[in-house]
């Protein structure tokens, strides 16, 4: 008699999961030799005892703590670029600008960037067939608990001047509800960050307006600023070009707005 | 079996560019780094650079900066170099080959050869 | 960028006899984590390099168990116990444990 399988609303587990991270953990491990210490076995037990055998909607940060402890890492504290809506550019502006880094530039960031995972309860299978979505199922799921917890850490180690990347194209081009505007943005410590400094970056070719003036960005600086840190604001009218400055910054036409 | 499959040999006028390729089989392309060697004229090897297929982070030697670009296709599971304004230093084999699981280059492509003459 | 160092050519070997071959490293290649980050490369003639040794002691696979190496953090020692006609090549050591990597510039082994 086949057993009965909880069908949850999102996708279920990425195929080739174990071996994906596995795999992630030793690529990243051998280009980063400051992180060869890590032991990516263990990694991989770490992360699967985070969910494993436990009910998908009832996963807690504690639940990740051995792998959070497997996966420390120091990076420059003021050369964090956090991001909402708009990964890809954030990406390929820390790999040409490599002292920057993204959540995603950091070994746990990396493992389970554009991963799905969730087991089931009292069973050691690992469910392909559907996750819980955070929205229509429920919200301590493995997936969102991790990113919230790597997030939160993340923002908690930054100082001096945080940059942020947000999407000018959205209705919303500051989120409450998204992980920056949820977790980053509320555990930014003011003891350490001078600054949060955003960078709109704008998607249509002759969208000349200031976007830093649209009402959800002037919301961020109001809870940046009874946080007491200071916000600024910039425009990033062409983000091909942006990126093109970034490479080549001697470049005559990189002294203009962009 | 795992095979690193490189284009045939290119011949190019200084100044020039040309991109070469290396077409992986027998793995899961997305599971390791490839990284890109060169031996000059008999002479030792030189780390290029790598790629992680899984996303296209790039990580270069810094004497190949601006020389190397390197990029991946996921579907054809295939990896390229392109090598830009070419002069006869760039005349040379390039292998292609791909990291282990305790990251020596475990397996090797037959090498490219790249003569640049006017 | 660290250095390998190798001399560019073996004492020549008589077959069935055993060859060293050493190298030297800039810097320790030892990590905090206890592997040594340095490895052996064979090119034979008119082929491409093969992996023989990882991490400074461990055989690759399909690699005959006459090959060995040894050493401290710069210094190192690859040992052939039994040479035989198939082991001509050059043999370039190298490290991974710094980018960039890098490779010694060959020593080649000459039968008698």
């Known amino acids: 008699v086949p057993r009965w399988r909880q069908q949850w609303s999102g996708p279920g587990t990425t195929k080739r999961f174990p071996e994906t991270v596995l795999a992630r953990c030793v690529k990243y491990t051998e280009i980063h030799p400051e992180m060869r210490h890590v032991d990516c076995q263990s990694v991989w037990d770490a992360f699967k005892g985070a969910f494993i055998s436990k009910h998908p909607c009832n996963i807690t940060e504690e639940d990740y703590q051995p792998l959070m402890k497997l996966g420390t890492q120091t990076v420059p504290c003021n050369k964090i670029l956090l991001w909402s809506r708009i990964k890809d550019l954030a990406h390929q502006f820390t790999q040409v600008q490599r002292d920057m880094f993204t959540l995603e530039d950091t070994l746990l960031g990396y493992l389970a960037d554009d991963l799905t995972w969730c087991g089931e309860f009292n069973t050691s299978k690992i469910n392909y067939q559907s996750c819980p979505d955070w929205r229509k199922d429920c919200s301590n799921n493995p997936v969102s608990v991790f990113w919230k917890t790597v997030s939160r850490r993340f923002a908690e180690a930054a100082c001096d001047v945080v940059h942020v990347m947000l999407n000018g194209s959205r209705s919303k081009i500051f989120d409450k509800n998204s992980t920056f505007g949820s977790v980053e943005v509320h555990n930014l410590q003011p003891e350490k960050v001078q600054t949060l400094e955003a960078w709109v970056i704008h998607g249509g070719r002759e969208d000349s307006r200031d976007l830093c003036q649209d009402p959800t960005i002037k919301e961020l600086e109001s809870i940046i600023s009874k946080r007491n840190i200071q916000f600024s604001c910039k425009n990033i009218y062409r983000p091909d070009k942006f990126l093109q400055c970034v490479k080549n910054p001697e470049d005559s036409s990189c002294t203009s707005e962009i | 079996e795992v095979q690193l499959q490189q284009s045939g040999p290119e011949l190019e006028k200084p100044g020039a560019s040309v991109k070469i390729s290396c077409k992986a089989s027998?793995?899961?392309?997305?599971?390791?780094?490839m990284n890109w060697v060169k031996q000059s004229n008999g002479k030792s090897l030189e780390w290029i650079g790598n790629?992680?297929?899984?996303?296209?982070?790039?990580t270069y030697n810094q004497k190949f900066k601006g020389k190397a670009t390197l990029t991946v296709d996921k579907s054809s599971s295939t990896a390229y170099m392109q090598l830009r304004s070419l002069t006869s230093e760039d005349s040379a084999v390039y292998y292609c080959?791909?990291?282990?699981?305790?990251?020596?280059?475990?397996?090797w492509g037959q090498g490219t050869l790249v003569t640049v003459s006017a | 960028d660290i250095v390998m160092t190798q001399a560019a050519f073996s004492n020549p070997v008589t077959l069935g006899t055993s060859a060293s071959i050493s190298c030297r490293s800039s810097?320790?290649?030892?990590?905090?984590?206890?592997?040594?980050?340095l490895y052996w490369y064979l090119q034979k003639p008119g082929q491409s390099p093969q992996l023989l040794i990882y991490?400074?002691?461990n055989l690759a696979s399909g690699v005959p168990d006459r090959f060995s190496s040894s050493g401290s953090g710069t210094d190192f020692t690859l040992r052939i116990s039994r040479v035989e006609a198939e082991d001509v090549g050059v043999y370039y050591c190298?490290?991974?444990?710094?980018?960039?990597?890098?490779f010694g510039g060959g020593t080649k082994l000459e039968i008698k």
């Open positions: 080959a791909r990291s282990g699981y305790r990251y020596g280059f475990v397996y």
């Open positions: 027998g793995y899961s392309f997305t599971d390791y780094n």
């Open positions: 790629i992680d297929p899984d996303y296209g982070g790039t």
């Open positions: 810097k320790s290649l030892l990590h905090s984590n206890g592997i040594t980050y």
């Open positions: 991490q400074m002691s």
């Open positions: 190298a490290q991974n444990l710094e980018l960039p990597w890098t």
